[in-house]
Interface confidence: low
């Protein structure tokens, strides 16, 4: 009876920095007792380790067992459906899960105003699961870049943008007053990782922030 159940149609990783989640799509017509078995293979150690015998969700947090992702050749995962004594064939991730698959994010963006400039500070992510020595800046130690998207409210202007190579940036507001909203997307110039836009941070600039000089 080993292969009576259909296999999960697809299995994939969605990952941010030290937040590595395996996802899969459910089998058609699954019953209330259907659950999913998850196994993990680390490249270089060619054997599958069972991680979960019976997950009833459609995702599983593999961060704790892939903490060495950033220092390894990567992983593959596989999932199969289980229902009582019946189980499906395995469905394996179709790409290797490596550091290249991690979507880059920022922790937060802090804005302040100084003499008509908006000064921005990008806080890098500090996930609780990360080992103490594995900081974002130690793993991505070179070529960190950020796209800064700026929107002025009110105003009928699009997002416009600039690129910076530091966690600190400044925006000259050209004497404008109003609310300025900023988003940041990280990248690493030497890598192909996707980046995710941060949530928008806004700051209001009024006349009081401009110093009059003679």
């Amino acid at each position: 009876h080993g292969t009576e159940l259909p296999s999960p149609p697809s299995v994939w990783f969605e990952a941010e920095f030290f937040h590595h989640i395996l996802h899969w799509t459910p089998i058609p017509n699954q019953s209330e007792s259907t659950c999913y078995e998850v196994a993990l293979l680390r490249y270089g150690i060619e054997s599958w380790n069972s991680i979960s015998n019976c997950s009833q969700t459609l995702s599983y947090d593999l961060t704790a067992v892939t903490l060495d992702l950033y220092h390894s050749n990567g992983y593959r995962a596989r999932v199969r459906a289980v229902d009582g004594s019946r189980h499906s064939n395995w469905t394996v991730t179709n790409t290797r899960f490596s550091v290249d698959e991690v979507t880059l994010t920022v922790g937060s963006v802090n804005l302040e105003i100084h003499n008509g400039f908006i000064l921005g500070k990008i806080q890098l992510p500090r996930p609780k699961m990360a080992p103490a020595n594995d900081t974002y800046e130690s793993i991505f130690s070179h070529f960190r870049e950020y796209e800064i998207a700026i929107r002025k409210v009110p105003g009928n202007f699009t997002f416009t943008h600039k690129k910076v190579k530091h966690e600190n940036f400044s925006l000259l507001t050209s004497g404008e007053v109003g609310e300025f909203c900023v988003q940041v997307k990280p990248s690493v110039a030497s890598r192909s990782n996707k980046g995710m836009w941060s949530k928008e941070e806004c700051i209001s600039l009024t006349r009081q922030y401009f110093t009059v000089t003679n």
Partner: antibody, heavy 120, light 107 residues
Framework: QVQLVQSGAEVKKPGASVKVSCKVS????????MHWVRQAPGKGLEWMGG????????IYAQKFQGRVSMTEDTSTDTAYMELSSLRSEDTAVYYC?????????????WGQGTTVTVSS | DIQMTQSPSSLSASVGDRVTITCRAS??????LAWYQQKPEKAPKSLIY???SLQSGVPSRFSGSGSGTDFTLTISSLQPEDFATYYC?????????FGGGTKVEIK
């Protein structure tokens, strides 16, 4: 809301120069990044140049380098585009257009266009 | 320079049709792409910015998608006033560059 109003049509002889103006209302010119785009009859849009606030200078498309000058009169909130050594292939509609202030921009607001005809 | 390639260069469609226009950049431009509509003897009008954000006042039947190198403008149900020429433009880096245009004509 920003509005851009351009100067009227011009007819010029080959070798001459033309200066097109673009008057801003609703915002001051210093709050904007002004660009110039042209369109030859029956052809597509071609960016000529514009102000890059990150560097604080005007960037020109290589094709027009040395022949075009883009200036601003902040006292009247008017931008100007001057094209010299005109030839017949410069016959086109010339548009000023602007977006926000920071870095390269999409062009959210356009002038109505100025037709320049170069003919002997 | 970043080349922008639009396709098709022209298309014929009827009122109510779903119309899709594509724009491909010669290198990655993130989301920094705008779409414009131009009618004969008129200045271009901005429809979409940042690849998928609708300009205020533009009908919701217009939508944009894509990032990196491949972008799409979709008109979900073509209206009589939508017959025009459409241009994409990248604003990731200078020089700013436009696609060659797509003329949408009445079938």
């Amino acid at each position: 809301q920003v509005q851009l109003v351009q100067s009227g049509a011009e007819v010029k002889k080959p070798g001459a120069s033309v200066k097109v103006s673009c008057k801003v209302s609703g915002f001051t010119l210093t709050e904007l990044s002004m660009h110039w785009v042209r369109q030859a009859p029956g052809k597509g849009l071609e960016w000529m140049g514009g102000f890059d606030p990150d560097d604080g200078e005007t960037i020109y498309a290589q094709k027009f380098q040395g022949r075009v000058s883009m200036t601003e009169d902040t006292s009247t909130d008017t931008a100007y585009m001057e094209l010299s050594s005109l030839r017949s292939e410069d016959t086109a509609v010339y548009y000023c257009a602007t977006g926000g202030y920071y870095g390269p921009v999409g062009m959210d607001v356009w002038g109505q266009g100025t037709t320049v005809t170069v003919s002997s | 320079d970043i080349q922008m390639t639009q396709s098709p260069s022209s298309l014929s469609a009827s009122v109510g049709d779903r119309v899709t226009i594509t724009c491909r950049a010669s290198q990655g431009i993130s989301i920094w792409l705008a779409w414009y509509q131009q009618k004969p003897e008129k200045a271009p009008k901005s429809l979409i910015y940042a690849a998928s954000s609708l300009q205020s006042g533009v009908p919701s039947r217009f939508s944009g998608s894509g990032s990196g190198t491949d972008f799409t403008l979709t008109i979900s149900s073509l209206q009589p006033e939508d017959f025009a020429t459409y241009y994409c433009q990248q604003y990731n880096s200078y020089p700013l560059t436009f696609g060659g245009g797509t003329k949408v004509e009445i079938k």
